[in-house]
Every structure is written in C-alpha cells, then in structure tokens.
Interface confidence: medium
C-alpha cells in the first residue's frame, strides 16, 4: 500500500478521509486506498478499440477514437462548440459558448442539440450516431466574460446517452491530479483548420504539450489566471482554433486511462508561434463538477 | 440598422455629477457587450469603460475608477455612464460603442454613437 | 498600460496614391489584438481592420492590415477622395485598452 500522509489540497483523499503521498492514484489499475475508493467509479475513459480545434496542424480521427467528444449544433446554426460526456446526463463544455451573442439565445438550453458518437459533421444520422437536447446550462458562477476566467459549463441532457462503441465517457481527474509541463496531451474539435478557414468535416485530433504555467504567463501577459493553462508549442504548428471551444483535452494517464485535462476556452489566432492556446482547469472544478450533477 | 444615440452631457462645474445615457436601437442590445470612449477636444481617442452583455461585469480605465460608473439596463436597451467628481480633464465627447463579439475574443469597438459633449469647466 | 504611437502624425498625399501608417507598441500585448479605426471631422470612429488583418464588414479591399508583435501597418492600396482622414489604432490584448495618437491623412 501507498504512505498515508497528512492530507493538503495537493493531496488524494481517499473515501474514508486518509490521503496518500502517492500523486494521480485514480483508476490506475492499483488501489492505493485501503477501503479501495481510488478505483471505484472507473468506468471512463477507456476506448473500445485499440490502434497506433479548432485543430490546426492536426489529422482525422479515427471513428470511435474519441467517444467522449460531443458535438454542440445551435438551432440553425450548424455545429458551435465541443463538449465532452462525463456521465449517461451531463457534459462539461466552455461557458463562453453560452453567452447570449448578436441576437441569438445561446444561454437558452433549448436551442441546442448535441451530437454524441459522431465523426462526421455531414453524416449526423449515421449509425451510432445519438441526438439529444439540452435540459439545463450550467455556467460557472465566476465565469467573466471579459477575460474568460472560470470558462467552463455543465450542460444536462434532456435524455441519458447510452454508452457504445462510439459512446463513452472521459474520466474526470481528482482536484489533487497534477498534468505536469511537457505532457502530451490530445485536442479534439470540428473547428476550424486554420485561422480565419473554416470547421472540418471529420473530427481532428492534434498532439499538444503542457507548457509551464510562468512561461504561459510571460507569453500572454496579464491576461493568464490560475484557472488557465497554455497547451501546445511555442513553434506553433499544432492548436485548438474557432469552433473547437468546449472540447476536452484528453490526457493519456497511468493504466492507459484517459482522463480530461482542460477544456478549449481561447487563444490568440490559431497555432501562432508564442501563442499557445489557452484550456480552462479541469482539476480546480472537480468539487464543483460533483456539486452540481453528482458525478 | 444599429443606432446608438448618445444624451445627457453639457456644461458642468469641476467636482459635480453628470449622468450620460445611450439608447440603442436595431439589434439586441441584451446580447452586446458595450463601451464608452471620450475623445478630448482636438485629441484622440481613450476608452473609459466597458460591461459585459449581462452588465455582470465592468471594465474602467485608470484615469475614471473610482468615480464612474457603468451601467445598462437591458429591458430599456440603454446604457448608462454615472460621472462624479468631474475634473476639467473629463472635458470631452463621449461616444458609446458596441464591442465586438466576445466568443471571438475581441475587445474591438464595431458600432458607435455620434457622440454627446460633457464640458467641465467653472 | 500599452503606449502605442503611431508615424508619421500627419502624411501628404495625392488621390490614387498608397498610404502606409505604422502603428508601434510599447510593449508585445498579442498580435492578433490590434484594430484600426477612420474617423472624419465631427464624425464618430469607423471599424477599419480588426484581428490585426481582418476587414470589418463593408470595408473596401483597398484596406489591409498586417503585423505583428510590436510593428503593426494600415496599409490603403489607392487613395480614394473619403479616404482623407484621422487613422487610430487600438490594441485590446491588454487592460487597458489603448488607442495611437493618430495619423491624418491629408490631400497633398
């Protein structure tokens, strides 16, 4: 077993309140607990095959590659934003999807549909293909819509996703979980493809890194919160661009598990050399996440 | 067509108040974010303040804070700009202006006002 | 705060001449944060440019913007008649948000 050590907000508190010197102990494949509550509530982030953003710089994925990424389609607007599935009922996107923007309701659930299990924007009827409506927003209580801090949402399905192939959900990591500078990490998206182009057809996927939080800061001065966090190269290449907000990254962790690092939030222009783009936290808002849906 | 009509400024002593108003007409006001920027006679151009579309969140410039106030009501499709403690430097035309879409990240000021004229002087 | 200066502050030329208005940056603020603006004698500021390089809406292709880090350029490929105007560029990267000084452009 792992040393229970006393317990910080840096560490992993196991179900029966002892914390663990052991970092990202989650649905390892080991239980660290002694009660076993560090692999309880796993059934995420796993895909049901194996094989070797706005994405800029990115390649199509493969279908049922990423069953946690959902597609968000305003009413008679086509696809707006991503999201990821966390449960049968809810999703965790960006708040800023959700504003109320030139004349349109985006706040209100009822004009949007999301789109779980899909790989090609013009094939939204294919086969494991699921359509649902939003029941309820659930947009941070701090999200500022100025400088985007505390960009993230809750979006409640009108009716539970049934898991598939092509439909799964991504783990959630542990307010302790730390995603270290130089990671890699995967972003999803049907966003555009180069800034100012256009969204893609099937989704994309880029391989980014974890870029450190002072350099993040030095490069996007006075506009970087603890909240925030810069992912991709300083070479620029590969990014999260228009269309691709809302969507996980998805971090490949201990057991092969994937757990949800961020979520796209902004960037300036697409893939730019110094400007990585910019992901909301996800570990801050785990309490937060469990507060207002119980997952 | 967006309209933004400016009102309220004139002619008033260094330490009083004024209130400016700005009515919006031909769009959805409740889904913009909005600004004021003056420009000092024969000068250019410096913003003042700004709210977000829900008027959760403001903005000021260092030059104001403290003793201007932002403000809209979205059911009246109208904003607001409180200034106290007026000092002759205040002296300026004081535009509203839309800001452009914040899902693009932009701070940019896409429609404005024909402006209305606040002079402080004793 | 960001101190941007514009150059030249006044420039003299003929209609279906080029215009080039530099716009420098006291500081790097993100270089798809700047716009420019026209504004006419008693008029309100008109959206040229946008994202650095991007044309707002019904603005002429006669328009360009470019640059980036600290050296921004509104460039007007051939002067036409309304052209002749006050030119301001604006970053909005970084609080708070700060306008040029101006350039006039003036019939020579």
């Known amino acids: 077993k792992v040393n229970v050590v006393t317990c910080t907000k840096h560490t992993y508190r196991c179900l029966n309140g002892l914390c663990l010197s052991k970092g990202n102990p989650e649905c390892d494949g080991k239980e660290d607990c002694s009660d076993g509550s560090d692999e309880k509530d796993c059934d995420c982030g796993l895909r049901s095959f194996t094989r070797q953003a706005r994405v800029v710089g990115g390649t199509d994925a493969d279908e049922g590659e990423w069953p946690w990424q959902v597609s968000l389609h305003a009413l008679g607007q086509g696809h707006i934003c991503g999201a990821s599935l966390i449960s049968p009922n809810w999703l965790v996107s960006a708040a800023h999807c959700y504003i109320d923007d030139r004349g349109f309701r985006y706040s209100d659930p009822t004009q949007w549909t999301a789109f779980l299990g899909l790989h090609d924007q013009s094939q939204r009827s294919a086969p494991g293909v699921q359509e649902r409506r939003l029941k309820r927003i659930i947009s941070h209580p701090f999200f500022n819509d100025f400088t985007f801090d505390y960009d993230i949402a809750l979006l409640e399905l009108e009716k539970p996703a049934e898991y598939s192939s092509m439909v799964r959900p991504i783990c959630l990591p542990d307010a302790s979980h730390v995603f270290p500078a130089g990671k890699a990490i995967w972003v999803t998206g049907w966003g555009h493809t180069q800034y100012g182009g256009t969204g893609a057809l099937i989704l994309q996927k880029g391989e980014i890194r974890v870029i450190n939080q002072t350099t993040c800061e030095n490069l996007l001065p006075q506009q970087i919160t603890p909240r925030m966090m810069c992912v991709g190269f300083l070479s620029g290449g590969v990014d999260s661009c228009q269309g691709d907000s809302g969507g996980p990254l998805s971090s490949v962790e201990a057991d092969g598990r994937i757990f949800q690092a961020g979520v796209v939030s902004w960037g300036d222009g697409c893939a730019q050399r110094n400007k990585p783009g910019v992901y909301t936290r996800l570990p801050l808002f785990r309490d937060w996440i469990k507060e207002n849906t119980g997952v | 067509e967006v309209q933004l009509l400016e009102s309220g400024g004139g002619l008033v002593q260094p330490g009083g108040s004024l209130r400016l108003s700005c009515a919006a007409s031909g769009f959805t006001f409740s889904s913009y974010a909005m600004s004021w920027v003056r420009q000092a006679p024969g000068k250019g151009l410096e913003w003042v303040s700004a709210i977000s579309s829900s008027g959760v969140n403001t903005h000021y410039a260092d030059s104001v804070k403290g003793r201007f106030t932002i403000s809209r009501d979205n059911s009246k499709n109208t904003l607001y700009l409180q200034m106290n403690s007026l000092r002759a430097e205040d002296t300026a035309v004081y535009y509203c202006?839309?800001?452009?879409?914040?899902?693009?990240?932009?701070?940019?000021?896409?429609?404005w006002g024909q402006g209305t004229l606040v002079t402080v002087s004793s | 705060e960001i101190v941007l200066t514009q150059s030249p502050g006044t420039l003299s030329l003929s209609p279906g001449e080029r215009a080039t208005l530099s716009c420098r940056a006291s500081q790097t603020f993100g270089s798809s944060y700047l716009a420019w603006y026209q504004q006419k004698p008693g008029q309100a500021p008109r959206l040229l440019i946008y994202?650095?390089?991007s044309r707002a809406t019904v603005i002429p292709d006669r328009f360009s913007g470019s640059g980036s880090g600290t050296d921004f350029t509104l460039t007007i490929s051939r002067l036409e008649p309304e052209d002749f105007a006050v030119y301001y560029c604006?970053?909005?990267?970084?609080?708070?948000?700060?306008f040029g000084q101006g350039t006039k452009v003036e019939i020579k």
């Open positions: 994202g650095a390089s």
């Open positions: 604006q970053q909005y990267g970084s609080s708070p948000w700060t």
């Open positions: 202006a839309t800001i452009a879409s914040i899902a693009l990240r932009g701070y940019y000021f896409d429609y």
